[in-house]
Interface confidence: medium
């Protein structure tokens, strides 16, 4: 801790301005009043303080606000935010989206730090749910944000917020997360017509059940292979060759390149070879002609 020393004559700060960058750490401690700093926080970020000087300013704020900073100060922290620990941030009550944006801007271009993760957690918990504006903001700064949430956390996302989600925001989502997001997307986009609906729902299809894939196959959607490869294996397996052909349209030819990868590999193993042959792609590994195909789920139900 910086020891208390008297402020030299004529150096008492009357505003937060550039002259302070020439103050030594002990002079900042002695000559900058905490109340002055707090009421002029919006000026700090425009001044190129050193990291050591920022430590002194943080120390002054910590003394003034031992229970945590008020939002009027948090909003103007600027680069001082980088000095905050997750423990500091847990004391805050951040309710304004403008405050959140201001702090995310400071960390822009960097990985999500523990400080930012704590800040977002405090903000979302304070709001009670991930509303559209918050989601818009978070995904703009961190495209992978949505996929960093647990299925439980995603369950608090209202369907209306799904409109804000871009395809790249879902790139790192796993099937469990898409299982939660897909029904919300379905609900959000349900009033759109066929082609528009498919454009919007496409990114979420990794959480779609078989029945919905069958329904899509009747709508001439021409799903690309990248989307098909992200579908749930258990949802793809029951699809017939004809349904997959309709689902993929002209992209069906891409199945050949993916025949050794899931879900295509597993799907091929479930199809009759003569049905696969109708595609004319040379797909191999289907059930040979004359073999009996048992529906194991039906067999279990009967026994």
């Amino acid at each position: 801790e910086v020891e208390k020393t008297a402020c030299p004559s004529g150096k008492k700060a009357r505003e937060i301005d550039e002259s302070l960058i020439f103050y030594k750490k002990w002079e900042l401690e002695a000559c900058v009043d905490a109340a002055l700093l707090a009421t002029q926080m919006d000026r700090v970020n425009a001044i190129p303080f050193t990291y050591e000087q920022l430590d002194v300013l943080k120390h002054k704020l910590d003394e003034l606000y031992p229970q945590g900073y008020p939002e009027s100060v948090i909003q103007h922290l600027g680069y001082l935010f980088l000095k905050m620990s997750p423990e500091d941030i847990r004391k805050w009550n951040v309710t304004s989206l403008e405050t959140l944006k201001a702090l995310l801007e400071v960390n822009k271009g960097h990985e999500m730090s523990p400080q930012v993760a704590t800040l977002i957690d405090r903000f979302v918990k304070g709001r009670g749910q991930l509303d559209k504006d918050t989601l818009d903001t978070l995904t703009a700064f961190y495209p992978g944000y949505l996929c960093s949430l647990s299925p439980e956390e995603l369950s608090s996302v209202p369907p209306s917020s799904i409109w804000a989600v871009r395809p790249q925001d879902l790139d790192t989502c796993d099937p469990r997360q898409l299982d939660v997001l897909y029904p919300k997307a379905r609900l959000a986009f349900q009033n759109m017509n066929g082609s528009e609906y498919f454009v919007k729902i496409q990114s979420f299809l990794g959480g779609a059940p078989t029945e919905d894939l069958k329904a899509l196959s009747q709508q001439n959607v021409s799903m690309d292979l990248a989307t098909f490869m992200k579908l749930r294996t258990d949802a793809v397996l029951p699809l017939t060759v004809a349904e997959v052909q309709k689902l993929l349209g002209p992209h069906v030819e891409g199945l050949k390149a993916e025949e050794r990868h899931r879900p295509v590999r597993d799907w091929i193993l479930r199809q009759r070879q003569d049905d696969l042959d109708t595609l004319g792609l040379g797909l191999q590994g289907g059930i040979p002609n004359g073999y009996l195909v048992l529906d194991l789920s039906m067999q279990e139900a009967l026994s």
Partner: antibody, heavy 119, light 112 residues
């Protein structure tokens, strides 16, 4: 709606200490980062800022009055107070309390109380 | 301390006519953060001052749009596009660039 109300004696003798209290209603004095201020207005004259306090007790005073001013706060009563020592006739004024927001917006004011310094 | 000087000190305007008040500071009120810390207050007869304009040109909530502020550096202006009877009182400019905050001496607006 936040309301502020000044109270205290309207007449103080020279060399004594002027004491005023401002009671805040309709909001907490320890609310989001607000500072609480005293401003005075000499009869027929302009406004002079005296100083401000945060609910934790941290203060900032106008250097011209600093040697004579003390501002204190009582969060349990939602009040803050002004003491001005060694008063003279030049301290006769209407004293206002006001809420100070970021960037120095004095957004809520009391109605003001006239203090006369006279023997 | 920063000294604030207002002109004119009094003004008499007919209802519906425009009014303009100038305020000059002894030092620039612009900070390197881009903000300029100049405020306008109106004190109606028998009342405390009320905030009209903050940071040169931003109207405070509930302030009619006939009030506008402009200026930069050391020279600032408050304009009332069409004066109404309720606008009478004393107008003060105030700076908070540097503590202590300081007020202009006031401009008294009367209705003709």
């Amino acid at each position: 709606q936040v309301q502020l109300q000044e109270s205290g004696p309207g007449l103080v003798k020279p060399s004594q200490t002027l004491s005023l209290t401002c009671t805040v209603s309709g909001g907490s004095i320890s609310g989001d980062g607000h500072f609480w201020s005293w401003i005075r207005q000499h009869p027929g004259k302009g406004l002079e800022w005296i100083g401000y306090i945060y609910y934790s007790g941290s203060t900032y005073y106008n250097p011209s009055l600093k040697s004579r001013v003390t501002i204190s706060v009582d969060t349990s009563k939602n009040q803050f107070s002004l003491k001005l020592s060694s008063v003279t006739a030049a301290d006769t004024a209407v004293y206002y309390c006001a809420r100070l927001r970021g960037g120095y917006k004095f957004d809520y004011w009391g109605q003001g109380t006239l203090v006369t310094v006279s023997s | 301390d920063i000294v604030m000087t207002q002109t004119p000190l009094s003004l008499s305007v007919a209802p519906g006519q425009p009014a303009s008040i100038s305020c000059q500071s002894s030092l620039s009120l612009q900070h390197s953060n881009g903000k300029t810390y100049l405020y306008w207050y109106l004190q109606k007869p028998g009342q405390p001052p009320q905030l009209l304009i903050y940071e040169v040109s931003n109207r405070f909530s509930g302030v009619p749009d006939r009030f506008s502020g402009s200026g930069s550096g050391t020279d600032f202006t408050l304009k009332i596009s069409r004066v109404e009877a309720e606008d009478v009182g004393i107008y003060y400019c105030m700076q908070s660039k540097q503590l202590p905050c300081s007020f202009g001496q006031g401009t008294k607006l009367e209705i003709k």
